[in-house]
C-alpha cells in the first residue's frame, strides 16, 4: 500500500487522522462502501476527546458511525475492540428496537441529536463520518 | 493531457480469458478510484467494477462476480480488468472512466475510448 | 439494486427545439443523480451532476432538475451537436452504480 501523509482536499486532520463530513444522507451500508472507495472507513470512536471532536463537526444531527451488529456481537469496521473500547451509547441504548415497523430490528451505530450513541435501522439516510489515519500505509478494509 | 487510453480488446472463444489495460495520465492515478463500464453493441451503459485508489477496495457487478478481477498499479498509472470465463453475453466496448466524489456524490467524470471485447466461437 | 427507467426510449426533434428527458428511480435517491450524454463511437461524457449542477464546460442550454424518485434533464433550444443518446445514472445506493436504458435524441 501507500502511506498517506497529508489529508486529502476538503478532509479535517485532527490527531493524525483525516476526517470527511457528509452533508448528505445514504444507507449505512453506502455509506460504508463510499468511505472505503475513499481508502477510508466509516468513523470509529476511540476517546472522549475524539467524541467531542467529531460531535463538534456534525452538529446536532443523526449521523452515521462505523459500529455495527448486523453479524450478531457490535463490532467497529476497523476491527478496534468494542468491549475493551470507548462507548457514548444513550441510556438504555442499544436496544435492538423492532417496533419501527420496517422489519428487523436496529444494527447500526449514529450519533444523535447531543452526540450519544443510539442503534437504529441501517436502512435509514443518515448523514456519515468517513475516518482515515495518516502515516498508516494503505490496506483493505475488513469484511463485515 | 488529461486522459485515459484503453487497450487489450480482441476475439476470444468463450470459456476464454482476456486481460484488459487502462493507461492514466494528466492527473494524480493512486487519488482517485477508478471503474470499468461495458457497453454491449446497440445497448446502453452498464457498470462492471469499482476499485479504490489504493487497490484495497473492489465492487462488482453480480453478472460479473467471481470471473472477473479488477487491479491497478499505481507506480505504472495503470488500471487492469481480468476476464476470465467469458461468455457471449460479455461482448461489449469496455470503457475505463475515473470516479469522482464530491460532497458525498459519485460519477464518472472522465471516460476512455474504450477497447472492444468480442466472445464467439 | 435500484432500477432506473427512462423517458421516451427515442424522440425526434428539430434545431431550436426544447427537449425534456425524464429519469425516475425505483425507490428515492435524493440528489445523486447525473446526466450523461453519448454519441455514436464516442465515450459518455459527463453533462449535470447532483441532479441540477452543470458539469464545467457543459453549455447551459443544459439543465437539470429534481429530487427523490423523478429527475428531469431539459435542453432549452437543440443544437445540431445535441444529437446523441442520453442516460441518467444513480450513486445513492452504490456500488452498483446503475444506468437508465438511454433516450436517443435524433433529428425529425
Known amino acids: 500500500g501507500s502511506e498517506r501523509t497529508c489529508c486529502p482536499v476538503n478532509w479535517v486532520e485532527h490527531e493524525r487522522s483525516c476526517y470527511w463530513f457528509s452533508r448528505s444522507g445514504k444507507a449505512w451500508a453506502d455509506a460504508d462502501n463510499y468511505c472505503r472507495l475513499e481508502d477510508a472507513h466509516l468513523v470509529v470512536v476511540t476517546s472522549w476527546e475524539e467524541q467531542k471532536f467529531v460531535q463538534h463537526h456534525i452538529g446536532p444531527v443523526n449521523t452515521w458511525m462505523g459500529l455495527h451488529d448486523q453479524n450478531g456481537p457490535w463490532k467497529w469496521v476497523d476491527g478496534t475492540d468494542y468491549e475493551t473500547g470507548f462507548k457514548n451509547w444513550r441510556p438504555e441504548q442499544p436496544d435492538d428496537w423492532y417496533g419501527h415497523g420496517l422489519g428487523g430490528g436496529e444494527d447500526c451505530a449514529h450519533f444523535t441529536d447531543d452526540g450519544r450513541w443510539n442503534d437504529d435501522v441501517c436502512q435509514r439516510p443518515y448523514r456519515w463520518v468517513c475516518e482515515t489515519e495518516l502515516d498508516k500505509a494503505s490496506q483493505e478494509p475488513p469484511l463485515l | 493531457e488529461v486522459q485515459l487510453l484503453e487497450s487489450g480488446g480482441g476475439l476470444v472463444q468463450p470459456g476464454g480469458s482476456l486481460r484488459l489495460s487502462c493507461a492514466a495520465s494528466?492527473?494524480?492515478?493512486?487519488?482517485?478510484?477508478m471503474n470499468w463500464v461495458r457497453q454491449a453493441p446497440g445497448k446502453g451503459l452498464e457498470w462492471v467494477s469499482v476499485i479504490s485508489g489504493s487497490g484495497g477496495s473492489t465492487y462488482y457487478a453480480d453478472s460479473v462476480k467471481g470471473r472477473f478481477t479488477i487491479s491497478r498499479d499505481n507506480s505504472k498509472n495503470t488500471l487492469y480488468l481480468q476476464m476470465n470465463s467469458l461468455r457471449a453475453e460479455d461482448t461489449a466496448v469496455y470503457y475505463c472512466a475515473k470516479r469522482i466524489a464530491a460532497a458525498g456524490t459519485e460519477y464518472f467524470d472522465l471516460w476512455g475510448r474504450g477497447t472492444l471485447v468480442t466472445v464467439s466461437s | 439494486d435500484i432500477q432506473m427507467t427512462q423517458s421516451p426510449s427515442s424522440l425526434s426533434a428539430s434545431v431550436g427545439d426544447r427537449v425534456t428527458i425524464t429519469c425516475r428511480a425505483s425507490?428515492?435517491?435524493?440528489?445523486?443523480l447525473y446526466w450523461y450524454q453519448q454519441k455514436p463511437g464516442k465515450a459518455p461524457k459527463l453533462l449535470i451532476y447532483?441532479?441540477?449542477s452543470l458539469q464545467s464546460g457543459v453549455p447551459s442550454r443544459f439543465s437539470g432538475s429534481g429530487s427523490g424518485t423523478d429527475f428531469t434533464l431539459t435542453i432549452s433550444s437543440l443544437q445540431p451537436e445535441d444529437f446523441a443518446t442520453y442516460y441518467c445514472q444513480q450513486s445513492y445506493s452504490a456500488p452498483p452504480f446503475t444506468f437508465g436504458p438511454g433516450t436517443k435524441v435524433d433529428i425529425k
Open positions: 447532483a441532479a441540477s
Open positions: 425507490q428515492s435517491i435524493s440528489s445523486y
Open positions: 494528466g492527473f494524480t492515478f493512486s487519488s482517485y478510484a
